[in-house]
C-alpha cells in the first residue's frame, strides 16, 4: 500500500503513504488512535 518511486540507479524518491490519523474521541483534545495494523 506504499507508493515509492525510484530513479534508474535505485535511489528512492518521495515519501511512502501517510495514513490520516483517526480521532475517535474527537470531542476531546486527544492523542490519535494508533494506526490500524497492516495486513
Amino acid at each position: 500500500s506504499y507508493s515509492m518511486e525510484h530513479f534508474r540507479w535505485g535511489k528512492p524518491v518521495g515519501k511512502k503513504r501517510r495514513p490520516v490519523k483517526v480521532y475517535p474521541n474527537g470531542a476531546e483534545d486527544e492523542s490519535a488512535e494508533a494506526f490500524p495494523l497492516e495486513f
Epitope: S1, S3, G14, K15, Y23, P36
Partner: antibody, heavy 113, light 112 residues
C-alpha cells in the same frame, strides 16, 4: 467545547479567488491532521486536500495547482485559498479534524457569473 | 488518486431489514477505511473506522468488514433513524505521487 467554524464563502465569478477560514476551538489545529472536504448541491462528499500535523500538504487532482491549504498557528485557524474558480467548484466546503466526528458546519461557495 | 466505488447508489428497504453496502478501492488500502452517515443538511457522522471498529456511541447493529480493496457496511436490523446516506472513505493517506484520501459516491438508504 471542541468545534470548527468555517467562514469566507459566498458568490464569486468564474476565474475568481476566495479564501476560506476554519477557526478551531477546544484543540490546537497544528497538532492534528486536518482535511478539507466539499459537497456540491445534491451530490456526494469529495476530499480536496490535507494538511498533516507536521505541515505537509497534499491535494486531490481536482484541487492541485489551484487550491492551497495553510494554517496560522497563532490564530488556531486553517485556510483554503482557492484560485481560478470554476462553476463546478460550487459546493459546501467543510474542514474536518482527521477521521472523526469533528466537522465544521460548512460554508457555501457559489461560482457563477 | 485512489478511487472509491460504492454500491448500490440507492437502496430501498424496510424497518427490520438487513442492509449491506459495499465499497471497493482502486488499490489496496489495508484497513484504512471509514464509514460515515449523513442526513440532509447535516455534517457527516463517523460510524466505523479501521474498517471494522465502531465509533463511540454507534449502535451495535452497525458493523464493518473487509481489507485490501473490498469492504462492507452492514446494518443488521434497519431502524427508522438509519434512513440516510452512507459514505465510505479511504484514509490511507498520500504520497508525492498519489492522493489517498477519497470518498465513495454514497449510498442513499430510503424507505421502501
Amino acid at each position: 467545547e471542541v468545534q470548527l467554524v468555517e467562514s469566507g464563502g459566498g458568490l464569486v465569478q468564474p476565474g475568481g479567488s476566495l479564501r476560506l477560514s476554519c477557526a478551531a476551538s477546544g484543540f490546537t489545529v497544528s497538532k492534528y491532521d486536518m482535511i478539507w472536504v466539499r459537497q456540491a448541491p445534491g451530490k456526494g462528499l469529495e476530499s480536496i486536500g490535507i494538511i498533516y500535523d507536521d505541515g505537509d500538504t497534499y491535494y486531490a487532482s481536482s484541487a492541485k495547482g489551484r487550491f492551497t491549504i495553510s494554517r496560522d498557528n497563532s490564530k488556531n485557524t486553517l485556510y483554503l485559498q482557492m484560485n481560478s474558480l470554476r462553476a463546478e467548484d460550487t459546493a459546501v466546503y467543510y474542514c474536518v479534524k482527521g477521521v472523526s466526528n469533528i466537522w465544521g458546519q460548512g460554508t457555501l461557495v457559489t461560482v457563477s457569473s | 488518486d485512489i478511487q472509491m466505488t460504492q454500491s448500490p447508489s440507492t437502496l430501498s428497504a424496510s424497518v427490520g431489514d438487513r442492509v449491506t453496502i459495499t465499497c471497493q478501492a482502486s488499490q489496496s488500502i489495508s484497513n484504512y477505511l471509514a464509514w460515515y452517515q449523513q442526513k440532509p443538511g447535516k455534517a457527516p457522522k463517523l460510524l466505523i473506522y479501521s474498517a471494522s471498529t465502531l465509533a463511540s456511541g454507534v449502535p451495535s447493529r452497525f458493523s464493518g468488514s473487509g481489507s485490501g480493496t473490498e469492504f462492507t457496511l452492514t446494518i443488521s436490523s434497519l431502524q427508522p433513524d438509519d434512513f440516510a446516506t452512507y459514505y465510505c472513505q479511504s484514509y490511507e493517506g498520500s504520497s508525492s505521487s498519489s492522493y489517498g484520501v477519497g470518498f465513495g459516491g454514497g449510498t442513499k438508504v430510503e424507505i421502501k
